[in-house]
Interface confidence: medium
Amino acid sequence: LPAQVAFTPYAPEPGSTCRLREYYDQTAQMCCSKCSPGQHAKVFCTKTSDTVCDSCEDSTYTQLWNWVPECLSCGSRCSSDQVETQACTREQNRICTCRPGWYCALSKQEGCRLCAPLRKCRPGFGVARPGTETSDVVCKPCAPGTFSNTTSSTDICRPHQICNVVAIPGNASMDAVCTSTSPTRSMAPGAVHLPQPVSTRSQHTQPTPEPSTAPSTSFLLPMGPSPPAEGSTGD
């Protein structure tokens, strides 16, 4: 740099502001250097010396140019229903998102504070609106001529098969049973699955408990006196 170039700190002109990446120190009444991301102000500037910056310690960070005396603490480790999508470094906070089969019931500035398992639609109900990263599954009763015989957060109502001769008529939770050797037309013989909507980045997918198991206790939100949503299991 040229020999005569002035370095911070310097006194700004009256009515002027400090340059970008500098801040005005009220005590010194000087424009001083900010610390870069991953650092914090170890010693504030004076009229004759610039800000002294130091690296953030383990498990702390600063994301912006700053003059804070201490780095911010990274958030706590991700819970079992979450996946760490961004690690804690000197320049960024840890970010936790919900694992597949769960959605974010309580978000924070970045990532999720509280995950909840996606609602499962019980037999006789199908998925009307799939779950997203931040919203639960919406179930609806299967309309006449359709059925769902599964407890699932992805299965939609499927049309009954059409028989030449009906042995047992279908209902909302069961397909029609035909007497002839084969139906004239079968609509979607297998279960129709919607794509898993949440946190597909994770490779650590764990199977969601089936309704025959005990209700999950890994997530407890005060529900108040209202009953579970119609067509959903108690999960």
Epitope: L1, P2, Q4, A6, F7, T8, E13, L20, W65
Partner: antibody, heavy 123, light 107 residues
């Protein structure tokens, strides 16, 4: 090599708004401040304001603080300047220019300039 | 705001001559001054920074001098390609300000 590619000429009606863009290439966009300069035959070169793309921090010439708003998108290495409530006085060539500003020093000059965007405000 | 005054709007010179363009600041700006060259239809180009340091892309016939309030850009052995307008600029403090420009005309 460093290049600043500005959007094409604009002809707009008085009272309208316009957004000019400046796409940077050939260097790390967030490492350098981006400044905007207005040029007219009457007033010559006038500094409008600046943005630090790394932080989004901005600085403005008081004369333009209600007229201009500068932003930057790191993902596309593009700086933008919105000009509001346009009048014939805003007809000019607008340049984006990179500031060399050495961190921690007063050294600060414009080493690369865009080709300029001509703005015409006319009814 | 700091006012940068280039009192001569036009200067006439001949190829091979030496010419000096002056700029006066309304208050002390130290050496926080740059000089720019702008050819017709082109963007400005930096020639001098920190009052006296030649930018890497500028020919060595361009020199800068001065500090405080009075600054000079000198072009030695003027060439026809030096036909342009020259602007001084202070970067001591926001808002950065430019001089009104001096047009160099080749006789």
């Amino acid at each position: 090599q460093v290049q600043l590619q500005q959007s094409g000429a604009e002809v707009v009606r008085p009272g309208a708004s316009v957004t000019l863009s400046c796409k940077a290439s050939g260097y790390t966009f967030s490492d350098y401040e981006m400044h905007w300069v207005k040029q007219t035959p009457v007033h010559g070169l006038e500094w409008i304001g600046a943005i630090d793309p790394e932080t989004g921090d901005t600085a403005y010439n008081q004369k333009f603080k209600d007229k201009a708003r500068v932003t930057a998108d790191k993902s596309s290495s593009t700086a933008y300047m919105e000009l509001r409530s346009l009048t014939s006085e805003d007809s000019a060539v607008y340049y984006c220019t990179r500031d060399i500003h050495y961190y921690g020093s007063s050294l600060s000059y414009f080493d690369y300039w865009g080709q300029g965007t001509t703005l015409t405000v006319s009814s | 705001d700091i006012v940068m005054t280039q009192s001569q709007k036009f200067m006439s010179t001949s190829v091979g001559d030496r010419v000096s363009v002056t700029c006066k600041a309304s208050q002390n700006v130290g050496t926080n001054v740059a000089w720019y060259q702008q050819k017709p239809g082109q963007s400005p180009k930096v020639m001098i920074y920190s009052a006296s340091y030649r930018y890497s892309g500028a020919p060595d016939r361009f020199t800068g001098s001065g500090s405080g309030t009075d600054f000079t850009l000198t072009v030695n052995n003027v060439q026809s390609e030096d036909l342009a307008e020259y602007f001084c600029q202070q970067y001591k403090t926001y808002p950065y300000t430019f001089g009104g420009g001096t047009k160099l005309e080749i006789e």
